[in-house]
Amino acid sequence: QPDAINAPVTCCYNFTNRKISVQRLASYRRITSSKCPKEAVIFKTIVAKEICADPKQKWVQDSMDHLDKQTQTPKT
């Protein structure tokens, strides 16, 4: 889970070791703050949980691409 040490900076200290299906993902945000020990991606899931993931992993990159395409495609 993400950890907000001194709001508004949220950092990730551990990454999930389990792939999450894109069907369970709602959005994401990147963590690039120099105040954090590592770069990370925080996925917000459809069940409101936030999960820290490693941006170097392929499934994480693929999931971000998928979510980017979803937001670019207008709902008709």
Epitope: R18, S21, I46, V47
Partner: antibody, heavy 119, light 109 residues
Framework: QVELVQSGAEVKKPGSSVKVSCKAS????????ISWVRQAPGQGLEWMGA????????HYAQKFQGRVTITADESTSTAYMELSSLRSEDTAVYYC????????????WGQGTLVTVSS | DIVLTQSPATLSLSPGERATLSCRAS???????LAWYQQKPGQAPRLLIY???SRATGVPARFSGSGSGTDFTLTISSLEPEDFAVYYC??????????FGQGTKVEIK
Amino acid sequence: QVELVQSGAEVKKPGSSVKVSCKASGGTFSSYGISWVRQAPGQGLEWMGAINPLAGHTHYAQKFQGRVTITADESTSTAYMELSSLRSEDTAVYYCARYDGIYGELDFWGQGTLVTVSS
Amino acid sequence: DIVLTQSPATLSLSPGERATLSCRASQSVSDAYLAWYQQKPGQAPRLLIYDASSRATGVPARFSGSGSGTDFTLTISSLEPEDFAVYYCQQYITYPPFTFGQGTKVEIK
């Protein structure tokens, strides 16, 4: 260690309702979902529905839509399954089981509650 | 809904033999969101395998899962007396509903 403890066996008349409880201990109740699964005598497992308190989601299998209500009380870490308009075919063992809403495998199960519907 | 079909319905084997149980889905179970459970008479099911191939905590190494898409397999490398039970597969990529297979009974020959 996570434990799910269900309420005791029930004998009900056709047309009535039954409410089964499932009290969780040893975990963060609101971070997980509770599924309800039933098993008629000598039959397989049948998923009835689920509740995910964190997200406020409740899902029901189409077969039980309108007849089942699943609720949760976070203050007591207890989930409930109410089944109405009971018929003899509803005689079964009813299980609650915990799942992580991001995934869905049922990692901890209650001991089961036998509901007998008989006139 | 995704329909899961397990085969065979019953498997008659002796202790020490290898058991291979099949679970076939009516449509692709993406991301291998499939689990296997063991159920003994009078007991609640017990999670054995999740994500098609990951063993749950405390599950012996003789149990292994494999497969993707529509075809999944549970293998018990060498049957122990306590392994004779009913085994169910379950998909959790779509909910509602999570669906179960009809079960495979592994009995002593």
